[in-house]
């Protein structure tokens, strides 16, 4: 059910493209295509190409994206396009000018002098933005989200966007300055991963990051399963970057025992992050027999 045909406008198309990109990434990283049939990979890649082509129809002259061409461009959506396209660039041919044009727009048009990224065109499909939907600490969570997207595009865009390293540093400094006052476990997790990507998740931020975990295995807010899966996935990625392999197993087991395999309303971010994190886990911790994920992928019928 994760491999679906993308369709719809600028936001819906990304909702549809997400699970297929992350499913192919996960199966590539974990070398599990034999289970599903290697020929399915090519079919999935065709769907990703279709999603990519369709998304270009919603690229505005500024290289930013919105649900419709007559709407103001969205910082969050543009950063998400950067994130998904950066991952898809390992799978299909992505025009680097398209990707890096979006990166340039984020930096030049949406980053304030203090490093914060601002949103002037909120997405219509609020269910696709995951834990960021809770408006509390929105400046930090949006800045962390964009910073992570910029880091993921860095290899492709550094040569084309001279201001990229400076932009990343500025955003990182803002997150550092805000981190100790954060209250939402979701923000602590996403911002913690952003800092980890910059090798800055160290004391006192590291203590705050680890102590925010409930029972040392999850970054949780009451009655928010999807947000908690998303947040804990960010935290797992941070722990893997830190090479804190002693703290990782209970986090992986918690994610695994949620029996969350993606799909469904409001699942875009949780799906993307849980499979990105578990793929990274299985790459970084090769003896991963303790991850007993019963994952199934179904291609759409023609």
């Amino acid at each position: 059910h994760l491999i679906v045909t993308p369709a719809g406008a600028g936001e819906q198309n990304m909702i549809g493209m997400t699970p297929t990109v992350i499913a192919v990434h996960y199966l590539d990283q974990t070398e599990q295509w034999e289970k599903f049939g290697i020929e399915k990979r090519q079919e999935a890649l065709e769907l990703i190409k279709k999603g990519y082509t369709q998304q270009l129809a919603f690229k505005q002259p500024s290289s930013a994206y919105a649900a419709f061409n007559n709407r103001p461009p969205s910082t969050w959506l543009t950063a998400y396009v950067v994130k998904v396209f950066s991952l898809a660039a390992n799978l299909i041919a992505i025009d680097s000018h398209v990707l890096c044009g979006a990166v340039k727009w984020l930096i030049l048009e949406k980053q304030k002098p203090d490093g914060v990224f601002q949103e002037d065109g909120p997405v219509i499909h609020q269910e696709m933005i995951g834990g960021f939907r809770n408006a509390k600490e929105a400046d930090v969570s949006l800045t962390a989200f964009v910073l992570i997207a910029l880091q993921e595009a860095r290899d492709i865009c550094e040569g084309q966007v001279n201001s990229l390293p400076g932009s990343i540093n500025k955003a990182g400094e803002y997150i550092e300055a805000s981190y100790m006052n954060l209250q939402r476990p979701y923000t602590v997790a996403i911002a913690g991963y952003a800092l980890a990507l910059m090798n800055k998740l160290e004391e006192p931020y590291l203590g705050k990051f680890l102590n925010t975990a409930k029972d040392r295995n999850r970054w949780e807010e009451p009655d928010q399963q999807l947000y908690n899966v998303e947040a804990t996935s960010y935290a797992l990625l941070a722990l893997l970057l830190l090479k804190d392999f002693d703290s990782v197993p209970p986090v992986v087991r918690w994610l695994n025992e949620q029996r969350y395999y993606g799909g469904g309303y409001g699942s875009t971010q949780a799906t993307f992050m849980v499979f990105q994190a578990l793929a990274q886990y299985q790459t970084d911790v090769p003896d991963h027999k303790d991850l007993n994920m019963d994952v199934s992928f179904h291609l759409p019928s023609r």
């Epitope: 029972d215 002693d246 209970p250 003896d287």
Partner: antibody, heavy 120, light 108 residues
Framework: QSLEESGGRLVTPGTPLTLTCTVS????????MAWVRQAPGKGLEYIGW??????TYYASWAKGRFTISKTSSTTVDLKMTSLTTEDTATYFC????????????????WGPGTLVTVSS | DGVMTQTPSSTSAAVGGTVTIKCQAS??????LSWYQQKPGQPPKLLIY???KLASGVPSRFKGSRSGTEYTLAISGVQREDAATYYC??????????FGAGTNVEIK
């Protein structure tokens, strides 16, 4: 930090029974709690555990007949149904070491145990 | 078949000697293993968690190690107060978790 089990007694087969673990010196809103039992002269047997949010995890053999629940910030119950003579044992509660998953970080401290005797 | 196979069921050692207890997991459990000491009439006491980490207040003569799916508790320089039954607890998943059968250690 200390724990104490209560509610153990002599019951007849088929009778339901609820044991209570009362903690002092810490709050269950930040700690995990496990239940383990030990039949007379036998080894330890893991039953299950509850996390600080109230989610429960059970050994496969215990599912359905045993229910762990948090009844306050200082008490956790173990409800047992359809008791048989095989359930005669001392029942222990134990906190997750350092507030973590007790199956990974270990169980510490433990209560002294409460004896349940099932006999007709 | 159980999750954990513990050997031996009993052993003895002289004061100052070494005791070695093993637990074999039925499949990979990585670091999901802890060791407990229990004396008659008392609850168990945590000795080792995460396969090799010493619990707070436990003497350094207790040492946990792992090789593949075999886990070892070694007590070097055994003291009289170490006479007890020792158990391992291994976990494949939350619903597939079990103690070993126990090892009774006698000090001569």
């Amino acid at each position: 930090q200390s724990l104490e089990e209560s509610g153990g007694r002599l019951v007849t087969p088929g009778t339901p029974l609820t044991l209570t673990c009362t903690v002092s010196g810490f709050s269950l809103s930040r700690y995990t709690m496990a239940w383990v039992r030990q039949a007379p002269g036998k080894g330890l047997e893991y039953i299950g555990w509850i996390d600080s949010s109230g989610s429960t995890y059970y050994a496969s053999w215990a599912k359905g007949r045993f229910t762990i629940s948090k009844t306050s910030s200082t008490t956790v119950d173990l409800k047992m149904t359809s008791l048989t003579t095989e359930d005669t044992a001392t029942y222990f509660c134990a906190s997750g070491n350092d507030g973590g998953d007790p199956l990974y970080y270990g169980m510490d401290p433990w209560g002294p145990g409460t004896l349940v005797t099932v006999s007709s | 078949d159980g999750v954990m196979t513990q050997t031996p069921s009993s052993t003895s050692a002289a004061v100052g000697g070494t005791v070695t207890i093993k637990c074999q997991a039925s499949q990979s459990i990585r670091s999901w293993l802890s060791w407990y000491q229990q004396k008659p009439g008392q609850p168990p006491k945590l000795l080792i968690y995460e396969a090799s980490k010493l619990a707070s207040g436990v003497p350094s003569r207790f040492k946990g190690s792992r090789s593949g799916t075999e886990y070892t508790l070694a007590i070097s320089g055994v003291q009289r107060e170490d006479a007890a039954t020792y158990y391992c607890l291994g976990s494949i998943a939350s619903d597939d978790t079990a103690f070993g059968a126990g090892t009774n250690v006698e000090i001569k």
